[in-house]
Amino acid sequence: AQGKEVVLLDFAAAGGELGWLTHPYGKGWDLMQNIMNDMPIYMYSVCNVMSGDQDNWLRTNWVYRGEAERIFIELKFTVRDCNSFPGGASSCKETFNLYYAESDLDYGTNFQKRLFTKIDTIAPDEITVSSDFEARHVKLNVEERSVGPLTRKGFYLAFQDIGACVALLSVRVYYKKCPELLQGLAHFPETIAGSDAPSLATVAGTCVDHAVVPPGGEEPRMHCAVDGEWLVPIGQCLCQAGYEKVEDACQACSPGFFKFEASESPCLECPEHTLPSPEGATSCECEEGFFRAPQDPASMPCTRPPSAPHYLTAVGMGAKVELRWTPPQDSGGREDIVYSVTCEQCWPESGECGPCEASVRYSEPPHGLTRTSVTVSDLEPHMNYTFTVEARNGVSGLVTSRSFRTASVSINQTEPPKVRLEGRSTTSLSVSWSIPPPQQSRVWKYEVTYRKKGDSNSYNVRRTEGFSVTLDDLAPDTTYLVQVQALTQEGQGAGSKVHEFQTLSPEGSGNLAV
């Protein structure tokens, strides 16, 4: 921003009323009126160009310094060409000297040269030559000087003529202020410019109404330079929640709009499924039945829990069940749907029911499922199972109602035993098997059926309560088909796969494990 000038003295504006002191009195400088640019103006002029050793002083009135630290002195003047005055070349000058003196009081007409300090010799950029003078083309010069730091209550300026033909048309003394400024939604007060050229005065800004320094942000600061210019802005303010930047101010969000945090962004329209917000809203309330999860941004539409999984099937395979379902028809407006599977088992004889999470095994953890299928194994035979698949999303926890679908399945058989060959010889095969522990209590005996491969007319059966058996009296180097089946009080369980095991040939005899 441009510097603000505070004028302490303006000769041209005073209309000749200032009554400056001339020394020697009645000689040298003279106050006169003239016409310039069709306007009457006052000026102090001196033109003693023929006599040598001129020492004519013009002193201003005492100027109260006030708060100024460095003053700027703008002079507008004309200087006539010494060549206009034949015979005066030796004594004629084309410069004059500018002085100042500080004091705490007005000395009135008591003028003492020794109190004055020279600021500079003032030389014109352009002199008024004879032809310009004749044509009324005055060459006006503008020179500026500055002095500081000033410390006393006031000061005088003085102009020393040493034999020039000079007219002072304007003497303007001012100091500079950095003007009141609104920047980055911060207000910076009018500040007096410092007196030392390299220094920059640091000025703290204050946030405008309804603006704040963002968390972790720097407080607004600017630097006021000697020339009254604001420089090097640091930090900023942002419109607080519920307000947006309009030019240099923070304005409340209009009804139907909101802003949830201090930021540079404008107010946003209330999202879907929200109630119309009042003026200055920081968020928009959800419509009835719609919710906002704690982690949801305020800009996100309000959502609701999903409907139940659309279609659920339970396919039994021995002591296993594969559950499959399709996503809810209504997602509630969210994408963070997960599924939870719970299991209940009922004993057919007693009709008693209870949870079965501890006794069954899931192909993946049954809570927070993102896929739409799961396999449940280790189910007990001759038991009724009810599976519940619940759909949940980020706002399900905000309501008491649940969205679920159930499917029931009866397990009529044990799971097929898993059979392995433990050892073999030329005439025997040692076989073992396993079934899930929860089912073992319901098994009465295991029935092992075996026969020679290719012989469909005869087979042998062995029963045992244990989990292994050795089949003897077998033919060497012969392949046998072996199957194991659990026997329960209710009947036969599911049979295992039919395995092909081969006895050793006589050459490779010895009881070798496979």
């Epitope: 016409i35 069709d38 002029s45 160009v49 006599s51 060549n83 009324r136 005055v138």
Partner: antibody, heavy 122, light 107 residues
Framework: EVQLLESGGGLVQPGGSLRLSCAAS????????MLWVRQAPGKGLEWVSR????????KYADSVKGRFTISRDNSKNTLYLQMNSLRAEDTAVYYC???????????????WGQGTMVTVSS | DIQMTQSPSSVSASVGDRVTITCRAS??????LAWYQQKPGKAPKLLIF???TLQSGVPSKFSGSKSGTDFTLTISSLQPEDSATYYC?????????FGGGTKVEIK
């Protein structure tokens, strides 16, 4: 005191010559443009001639052009008007005057002499 | 040449009266016009320059104004010492020319 004092007037026959002088005092003479103005008996004012500060710039009324010469000697603070081929109609009080400004060429005349009478008659 | 036509040629007024003298230029002269007062047997005295600027030391009862090519000198309250002939003069261009004069008398 700022003053201009004319001299050199008198009675002269038609066709004759006179040299008027104007002595300046109380101010620095050299920067100012100077002028001659005349006033015939019972008549109004008539501008005659002007000279710039350096003496190099001169102007004349058509009625005296070629007959009168204006000059100055800044070292003597004196203005001159050499009048040749005088005519009866040149009879007048001759005033020297100072242009009022050293800053802007301005032909308003702020200082006047008391005048010297020139009579052209046979 | 620029002709300066002054009117009236004479005026007789009482002490305390407001007196107005007009000067018309034959062509535009901007503000380059002066007014002089001349008393019998004396040299002219500069009253106003630049059409309206009062010369230092001249009483404020004298004022000047401009309207186009018409210029006016006004004496706001005539006093016996104001009895004189008043001349206008243009200094916009050469030859410098004066008006014919206006003689002001006290009744």
């Amino acid at each position: 005191e700022v003053q201009l004092l004319e001299s050199g007037g008198g009675l002269v026959q038609p066709g004759g010559s006179l040299r008027l002088s104007c002595a300046a005092s109380g101010f620095t003479f050299s920067p100012y443009d100077m002028l001659w103005v005349r006033q015939a008996p019972g008549k109004g004012l008539e501008w005659v001639s002007r000279i710039g500060s350096s003496g190099g710039y001169t102007k004349y009324a058509d009625s005296v052009k070629g007959r009168f010469t204006i000059s100055r000697d800044n070292s003597k603070n004196t203005l001159y008007l050499q009048m040749n081929s005088l005519r009866a109609e040149d009879t007048a009080v001759y005033y020297c005057a100072r242009a009022r400004s050293v800053v802007v060429s301005s032909d308003a005349f702020d200082i006047w002499g008391q005048g010297t009478m020139v009579t052209v008659s046979s | 040449d620029i002709q300066m036509t002054q009117s009236p040629s004479s005026v007789s007024a009482s002490v305390g009266d407001r007196v107005t003298i007009t000067c018309r230029a034959s062509q535009g002269i901007s503000k380059w016009l002066a007014w002089y007062q001349q008393k019998p047997g004396k040299a002219p005295k500069l009253l106003i320059f630049g059409a309206s600027t009062l010369q230092s030391g001249v009483p404020s009862k004298f004022s000047g104004s401009k309207s186009g090519t018409d210029f006016t000198l006004t004496i706001s309250s005539l006093q016996p010492e104001d009895s004189a002939t008043y001349y206008c003069q243009q200094y916009n261009d050469y030859p410098l020319t004066f008006g014919g004069g206006t003689k002001v008398e006290i009744k």
